[in-house]
Interface confidence: medium
């Protein structure tokens, strides 16, 4: 089966630069196939931009001003590039590769999509940290005693832009868990966020993560942010000792003994 | 210029209860072009759901059902047993590929109809409270609760923010809701919540203990041997001097 | 910059699994095709395989049953196994990124490479 | 699949052009890449897409590609040009190495 990968969530630009979107094609080879672009601007009708065929020819749709968008394909990796000369605001859209994948059942044909990169164009400065920074919350004693499971809650803070995506997993495990997230919100000039995973009282000695893609997140990949196993038996700690790496470490314990 | 125009800009569906979005063309028959289904959920992932000739993404084609009204010029798509995986926005779209004349492989889109899903009607429940600590952070947990209005109050003399609550269905088909906020005084923070005329405490849900109000660690888990009374995280994270974890007890 | 610093055993035995890690540093493991390349003492490249960051694997069909390519995102590093190895398999393994745009044809980045001898 | 062949020597004096040819079936419908590497060092990358020079190369090399040759130019050669260059190009998903030429600065 096809599948499609757009490894930009989102792609940052100011006015007049150019933006070069990526796609990448599994499972099928891209030379003995199409791909499709097309974009979704807000409260606008997904349309249909510009294909580049097996053999390379390049359709563009009928409207579509020429020299806007390029497109090419790398056979080799199975890559193709949507390139956005000299952005302006009425490109702000989310950008979608697609194709056609045969199915099992001869002459059946499906279009899969790819997951959209979102084009952003900013006229800000800002500063140079805009990744996520995360904030981790523990299960309260209470709702491992009284519920017979814990809660686990990732706040993600001061990141630009709005695009994000949280999902959660257990060390060792690639299968994803079920968690619910409430609706990113602006604070100033950047973003907040935060998810939050329900695991029964057997799961609370497993190490949990919480996996987050970011445009800004350092060196490009998932920000991988550890829950630590919880010990049920354990109800408190002395809370005069915190618990941290050596001082020039960023990275800080804080052992909180309150009674919730 | 064709045009898929849907029914309805927005669909309430209640969890368990059949769905039937519907969407027409304007400007030519339908029955010359292929209808077909997509959902977008949140993270702008486009699922194929339908295609005419009986085509079904993979997991659809249990609880989905596509039809057409030739006579309507409209497209149909029945969700048989939403869930609250369903909710997201569905859109129509058509294409000639493979069928004769002048085809176009490119897919014309309708506008989308946001689905949203809503636990079917139950008996009233009320939602058990606990409040988790980060610092200055704060945030209240308010568990498997019906029906959905809500009040959630972080009680505090020093507020320094707080955020709107998310509200969200639970697995087991009731509410969740989760609000936050930052304080000076994280540490004397209580949550109350006002739910169905009833105000519901997190102190109602502390676990009571003995005198000291406190369970002390053991002899070999004491303080002076932190590898054993705390765990560090590996977080691979980079942030700065956030407070990165609390063991809230 | 992105560095690739490659780590892993020189001395190895005939029929045993050959296992080299190149860690990615200064730079994103993220978008990238990364790769395996060995060069056999006075001989020429041969290329060995790549994998996306993302999972997606190639390999050269000469290597393909014996070869595996991993990457550890968490990590920033890129693993290669090569199963049953036998005296023709001494030679110096590089690993190596190909670049991006147009630079997606080419080898743009390489590990200072790690000598691999197989001898019983 | 597609094999790239070299000449194993080239030789030329300082201040001379040098050209290094590959050659292959329909390498011009391909994109060629030419690497150099010096003893005990990794390869470093000199031309790609047929003609272009990565940044930190110098403009004395040069590439070009059409029929079923490429061809790696070095002009004014200098003794620090002295190493083996490869050629490499894709066929189809596979990479492609030629086999090497071996540039002797006299």
């Known amino acids: 089966a096809g599948h499609l990968e757009q490894p930009q969530i989102s792609s940052t630009k100011t006015l007049s630069k150019t933006a070069r979107l990526e796609c990448v094609v599994s499972g099928i080879t891209i030379s003995a196939t199409s791909v499709y672009w097309y974009r979704e601007r807000p409260g606008e009708v997904i349309q249909f931009l510009v294909s580049i065929s097996y053999d390379g020819t390049v359709r563009k749709e009928s409207g579509i001003p020429s020299g806007k968008f390029e497109v090419d394909r790398i056979p080799e990796t199975s890559t193709s590039t949507l390139t956005i000369h000299n952005v302006e605001k009425q490109d702000i859209a989310t950008y979608y590769c697609a194709l056609w994948e045969a199915q099992q059942e001869l002459g059946k044909k499906i279009k899969v999509f790819g997951p959209g990169t979102k084009l952003i164009i900013t006229d800000k400065q800002l500063d140079a940290d805009v990744s996520p920074k995360p904030t981790i919350f523990l299960p309260s004693i209470a709702e491992t005693k009284l519920q017979k499971a814990g809660t686990y809650l990732c706040l993600l803070e001061k990141f630009f832009p709005d695009v994000i995506k949280i999902h959660w997993q257990e060390k060792k495990s690639n299968t994803i868990l079920g968690s619910q997230e409430g609706n990113t919100m602006k604070t100033n000039d950047t973003y907040m966020k935060f998810s939050w995973l329900t695991v029964p009282e057997k799961s609370l000695d497993k190490e949990h993560r919480c996996i987050v893609r970011h445009e800004n997140n350092k060196n490009g990949v998932d920000q991988e942010i550890i829950f630590p196993p919880i010990k049920t038996d354990v109800i408190t700690m002395d809370p005069k000792d915190n618990c941290s790496k050596d001082a020039n470490d960023t990275l800080l314990l804080q052992l909180t003994n309150t009674s919730a | 210029a064709i045009e898929l125009v849907p029914e309805h800009q927005t669909v309430p569906v209640s969890i368990g209860v059949p769905a039937t979005l519907r969407c027409s063309m304007k400007g030519e028959a339908i029955g010359n072009y292929y209808i077909n289904w997509y959902r977008k959920t949140q993270g702008n992932t486009m699922t194929f759901i339908y295609r005419e000739k009986d085509i079904y993404g993979p997991g659809f084609k249990d609880n989905f059902q596509g039809d057409i009204d030739i006579a309507k010029n409209l497209a149909v798509l029945k969700i048989l047993a939403p869930s609250e995986r369903d909710e997201g926005s569905y859109y129509c779209a058509c294409d000639t590929l493979g069928m004769g004349g002048e085809y176009t492989d490119k897919l014309i889109f309708g506008k989308g109809t946001r689905v949203t899903v809503e636990p079917r009607s139950q008996p009233h429940t009320k939602p058990s409270v606990f409040v988790m600590k980060n610092g200055t952070n704060v945030a209240c947990l308010v568990k498997e609760f019906y029906p959905k209005d809500i009040r959630i109050n972080l009680v505090s003399s020093k507020k320094i923010t707080e955020f709107d609550p998310a509200i969200v269905i639970s697995p087991s088909g009731k509410y969740n809701a989760v609000k936050l906020g930052k304080y000076e005084d994280s540490n004397s923070v209580t949550c109350s919540v006002q739910h169905d005329n009833k105000t519901v405490h997190s102190t109602d849900f502390e676990v009571k203990t003995d005198s000291t109000d406190h369970v002390k660690p053991k002899e070999t888990e004491n303080t002076k041997q932190p590898s054993k009374s705390c765990h560090k995280p590996k977080a691979i994270v980079h942030t700065e001097k956030v407070n990165m974890m609390s063991l809230t007890v | 910059q992105v560095q690739l610093v490659q780590s892993g055993p020189g001395l190895m035995k005939p029929s045993e699994t050959l296992s080299l890690t190149c860690t990615v540093s200064?730079?994103?493991?993220?978008?990238?095709?990364w790769n395996w390349i060995r060069q056999p003492p006075g001989k020429g490249l041969e290329w060995i395989g790549y994998?996306?960051?993302?999972?997606?694997?190639n390999y050269n069909p000469s290597l393909k049953s014996r070869v595996t390519i991993s990457v550890d995102t968490s990590k920033n590093l890129v693993s290669l196994k090569l199963n049953s190895v036998t005296a023709a398999d001494t030679a110096v393994y590089f690993c190596?990124?190909?670049?991006?745009?147009?630079?997606?044809?080419?080898?743009?980045?390489w590990g200072q490479g790690t000598m691999v001898t197989v001898s019983s | 699949s597609s094999e790239l062949t070299q000449p194993p020597s080239v030789s030329v004096s300082p201040g001379q052009t040098a050209s290094i040819t590959c050659s292959g079936d329909?390498?011009?419908?391909?994109?060629a890449c030419w690497y150099q590497q010096k003893p005990g060092q990794s390869p470093v990358l000199v031309i790609y897409?047929?003609?272009k020079r990565p940044s930190g190369i110098p403009e004395r090399f040069s590439g070009s590609n059409s029929g079923n040759t490429a061809t790696l130019t070095i002009s004014g050669t200098q003794a620090m040009d002295e190493a083996d260059y490869y050629c490499?190009?894709?066929?189809?998903?596979?990479?492609?190495f030629g086999g090497g030429t071996k540039l002797t600065v006299l």
């Open positions: 190596a990124k190909l670049g991006k745009w147009e630079l997606r044809t080419a080898f743009d980045i």
């Open positions: 200064n730079g994103s493991i993220s978008g990238y095709f």
């Open positions: 994998i996306f960051y993302s999972g997606s694997t």
């Open positions: 329909k390498l011009g419908d391909k994109y």
């Open positions: 897409q047929d003609s």
């Open positions: 490499q190009a894709w066929d189809s998903s596979t990479v492609v």
